[in-house]
Interface confidence: medium
């Protein structure tokens, strides 16, 4: 099936009742598209990126927030944004690249020494359990004396990459995002042109380990461009 | 400590409607998807709905849609499903339950009886 | 949809004994499974997570196993606390769907 070729980086079309019927009329299901996965992505390059639209940061890629392009401009027009880099102005957690957080409006790096001093604005959990992940999607609560000494195992909630144990990633499935295996060589990988529009799909892959690129699996290249196949492959 | 508080079951007539809520403390309630679940008695579990923690995506099972509807109030922390047009078939304990059921509620009766 | 088989669907044990519950899906859901107690009259619990990973503040003598389509529930030494309903669930795809359960008695 297409999840054992997956690994766990589960991705699938919606079928109809989802992409469409599942979100009640009036619901922001086929409104709202969720993105595969990201757009900053450092293991991966996206062509023709195209801005896209998002109605909260879980529908962005781990790189990515979601918000209006211009300041003060229209909150109902929202996209996809690249996330801000250290010392860079923020307003929370999620506007930050993984690896910062969000303190005092400015984004700041969420290493294990600033973690037990500094963050006063994110409730550790994992999975809602006492472990150590960042819950859900936190944005602003308060910290127990519980410190930051593991991090998501598989298939724990988690905020961004950086919540989950070395070689997980942190993506979307359904309407939470979870820790989940990044890619190895060989594995189905997910290039995002960005054209058009997508249909709701809820389910993120990761992205390729170091040292891999997703691209174009060579017995595919004849293949017309909606079905090709990209894999992980060696640079 | 996480706790999901049930309520606006009863005794409601086939065709009729009802509203459940579900009062949510002991976590940030916006930063979870929640779902809601239930057992008619003496039977197993059924799935009836989700929702992201934004609001901005619902799902449902196949049996419910287009007759119940899910939403949220993050200012309130609390969780709503709308029944319309309710069923025999709709008896059960409706439990709210956070993330992927991480966590329940104690569950409230809904039963649908002439 | 995909169907979520438990079984044995009812077993009688002693407390002591290693008990072993399997479920078995339709389609490969890899590793997104969880297993849940349930007691008479309350919600159910979760036990583990991730087919594999133990819920916080569960004892350490339930684990799960599997990924897949084959998934298993061990109760290294059951105690008279585990006497329950235990489910199965799968939230590869939605619906999201659940065993039908497998009652866990004293012999």
């Known amino acids: 099936t297409l999840n054992s070729v997956l690994n766990s980086n589960a991705i699938k079309n919606l079928p109809p009742p989802l992409g469409g019927a599942a979100g009640h009329p009036g619901s922001a299901v086929s409104a709202a598209p969720g993105i595969l996965y990201p757009g900053g992505n450092k293991y991966q390059t996206i062509d023709n990126y195209q801005p896209y639209p998002c109605a909260e940061d879980e529908e962005c890629g781990t790189d990515e927030y979601c918000a209006s392009p211009t300041r003060g401009g229209d909150a109902g027009v929202q996209i996809c944004l690249a996330c801000r880099k250290r010392r860079k102005r923020c307003m929370r957690h999620a506007m930050c690249c993984p690896g910062n957080y969000c303190k005092n409006g400015i984004c700041v790096s969420s290493d294990q020494n600033n973690f037990r001093g500094e963050i006063e604005e994110t409730i550790t959990e994992s999975f809602g359990n006492d472990h150590s992940t960042l819950d859900g999607y936190s944005r602003r609560t308060t910290l127990s004396s519980k410190m930051y000494h593991s991090k998501g195992q598989e298939g724990s909630v988690c905020l961004r990459s950086s919540d989950c144990a070395t070689g997980l990633c942190c993506a979307r499935h359904f309407w939470s995002k979870i820790c989940k295996p990044v890619l190895k060589e060989g594995q189905v990988c997910t290039k995002h042109r960005r054209k058009g529009s997508h249909g709701l799909e809820i389910f993120q892959r990761c992205y390729c380990g170091e040292g891999l690129s997703c691209r174009i699996q060579k017995d595919h290249h004849q293949a017309s461009n909606s079905s090709r196949l990209h894999t992980c492959q060696r640079h | 400590q996480v706790q999901l508080v049930e309520s606006g079951g009863g005794l409601v007539q086939p065709g009729g409607s009802l509203r459940l809520s579900c009062a949510a403390s002991g976590f940030t309630f916006s930063s979870y998807g929640m779902s809601w679940v239930r057992q008619a008695p003496g039977k197993g579990l059924e799935w009836v709905s989700g929702?992201?923690?934004?609001?901005?995506?619902?799902y449902y099972a196949d049996s419910v849609k287009g007759r119940f509807t899910i939403s949220r109030d993050n200012s309130k922390n609390t969780l709503y499903l709308q029944m319309n047009s309710l069923r025999a078939e709709d008896t059960a304990v409706y439990y709210c339950a956070r993330h992927y059921m991480d966590h329940w509620g104690q569950g409230t009766l809904v039963t649908v009886s002439s | 949809d995909i169907q979520m088989t438990q079984s044995p669907s009812s077993l009688s044990a002693s407390v002591g004994d290693r008990v072993t519950i399997t479920c078995r899906a339709s389609q490969d859901i890899s590793n997104y499974l969880h297993w849940y107690q349930q007691k008479p009259g309350k919600a159910p619990k979760l036990l583990i997570y991730g087919a594999s990973n133990l819920q916080s503040g569960v004892p350490s003598r339930f684990s799960g196993s599997g990924s897949g389509t084959d998934f298993t529930l061990t109760i290294s030494s059951l105690q008279p606390e585990d006497f329950a309903v235990y489910y199965c669930?799968?939230?590869?795809?939605?619906?999201?769907?659940f065993g039908q359960g497998t009652k866990v008695e004293i012999k």
């Open positions: 929702i992201s923690g934004s609001g901005s995506y619902t």
């Open positions: 669930q799968q939230y590869d795809s939605i619906p999201m769907t």
